[in-house]
């Protein structure tokens, strides 16, 4: 039994880091393998992660972390029984994938304006809380070419757009994702999408 693709890990910079790897053949990850992880720090002890299958030869492990700070560093040991298959390290702050924003809502009751709001996925005491920026994706269910991205570079989790920038009388969907420049993170996953019917009064055309 050998590791074909070494574990790579990303952290949500809150409580979970996710590590993925591939074995050289079909593997029952949960019965055959264990990933031990230990914070490199005074009086820390190793924790055991039981991996799950992720495709035939792929494995994924969700490492639970009680806290995360910029200086954290973990040792990782992948075991198959008594055999050490791989040894490595992981610094969560260097591999951050933020949590996806939640509670995306489209408010259509403001005249001729669409207000999109969502929730910051971090609590106020987390470092990322004040460092997230967002991308909002809006698309038409009827027209695949009607697809747009709005970059929200301010901290407030909201976006206002004129209803008239979208076609009237058709349904749209929106979703939002986040990233943090401070840690050069990857983008989060997209939030679940939300749907609304766009309708507004067309201005009378003057001839």
């Amino acid at each position: 039994m050998k590791v074909l693709q070494e574990p790579t890990c990303v952290s949500d910079y809150m409580s979970i880091s996710t590590c993925e790897w591939k074995m050289n053949g079909p593997t029952n990850c949960s019965t055959e393998l264990r990933l031990l992880y230990q914070l490199v720090f005074l009086l820390s002890e190793a924790h055991t992660c039981i991996p799950e299958n992720n495709g035939g030869a792929g494995c994924v492990c969700h490492l639970l972390m009680d806290d995360v700070v910029s200086a954290d560093n973990y040792t990782l040991d992948l075991w198959a029984g008594q055999q050490l298959l791989w040894k490595g390290s992981f610094k969560p702050s260097e591999h951050v994938k933020p949590r996806a924003p939640g509670n995306l809502t489209v408010h259509t009751n403001v005249s001729d304006t669409l207000l999109l709001t969502w929730s910051n996925p971090y609590p106020p005491d987390n470092y990322l809380y004040n460092h997230l920026t967002y991308a909002v994706n809006i698309w038409s269910e009827n027209d695949p070419a009607d697809f747009r991205i709005y970059n929200v570079t301010y901290l407030e989790p909201s976006l206002r757009i004129a209803a008239s920038t979208l076609k009237s009388g058709i349904s749209y969907r929106a979703r939002v994702r986040a990233w943090a420049q401070c840690y050069n993170t990857t983008w989060s996953e997209w939030s679940p999408s939300t749907k609304w019917h766009n309708s507004y009064r067309e201005p009378f055309e003057q001839h």
């Epitope: 914070l39 720090f41 005074l42 009086l43 820390s44 002890e45 009680d66 806290d67 700070v69 910029s70 200086a71």
Partner: antibody, heavy 118, light 107 residues
Framework: EVQLVESGGGLVQPGRSLRLSCEAS????????MHWVRQAPGKGLEWVSG????????GYADSVKGRFTISRDNAKNSLYLEMNSLRPEDTALYYC???????????WGQGTLVTVSS | DIQMTQSPSSVSASVGDRVTITCRAS??????LAWYQQSPGKAPKLLIN???RLQSGVPSRFSGSGSGTDFTLTINSLQPEDFVTYYC?????????FGQGTRLEIK
């Protein structure tokens, strides 16, 4: 509510022994490392000893190494400090403290006073 | 052993003032530094952890900064209950060591 209650202090002659206890409640005791910190009358804080969740890792201050032994009983939510060959300079208020995983003591007991004198 | 040197050892100030206490480590301790407040006859109370994180329940007038060897604790708009003793503590390596303390007195 986290509570740490120390006991076992008292007046003891130089060269004798004493065993301190700390009873913990309000948190999952076996998830955290624990420590003893002392403070001589009118002086600053001095770290004495600490041990990890399952006692696989232990540290001592040079001043107590070889004389003091730290231990814990996770089933009883209790921390102990066995103090042998006590010296007058060990006279202090001994605090039990919970380790906050990133190098800080987030909860402290009220302390138990150890006086070493003939 | 890592020596922690606090300065000043005592400082006089008035209610409403801003005070800064510094702590210097004899070698690099990254961000593994905490600050405590101790009132007479009481156990120490954690104020700041990992150099700059405010402990839950601690008033926002307290703040910490620094990394490596130089750290500061700042108290803005001093309140009467702040006139007590403050300690820094490193946890980069054993033995864990504290600064000698800074006593904050009313002017």
């Amino acid at each position: 509510e986290v509570q740490l209650v120390e006991s076992g202090g008292g007046l003891v002659q130089p060269g004798r022994s004493l065993r301190l206890s700390c009873e913990a409640s309000g948190f999952t005791f076996d998830d955290y490392a624990m420590h003893w910190v002392r403070q001589a009358p009118g002086k600053g804080l001095e770290w004495v000893s600490g041990l990890s969740r399952t006692s696989v890792s232990i540290g001592y201050a040079d001043s107590v190494k070889g004389r003091f032994t730290i231990s814990r009983d996770n089933a009883k939510n209790s921390l102990y400090l066995e103090m042998n060959s006590l010296r007058p300079e060990d006279t202090a208020l001994y605090y039990c403290a919970k380790w906050g995983t990133r190098g800080y003591f987030d909860y402290w007991g009220q302390g138990t006073l150890v006086t070493v004198s003939s | 052993d890592i020596q922690m040197t606090q300065s000043p050892s005592s400082v006089s100030a008035s209610v409403g003032d801003r005070v800064t206490i510094t702590c210097r480590a004899s070698q690099d301790i990254s961000i593994w530094l905490a600050w405590y407040q101790q009132s007479p006859g009481k156990a120490p109370k954690l104020l700041i952890n990992v150099a700059s994180r405010l402990q839950s329940g601690v008033p926002s007038r307290f703040s910490g900064s620094g990394s490596g060897t130089d750290f500061t604790l700042t108290i803005n708009s001093l309140q009467p209950e702040d006139f007590v003793t403050y300690y820094c503590q490193q946890a980069n390596s054993f033995p864990i060591t504290f600064g000698q303390g800074t006593r904050l007195e009313i002017k």
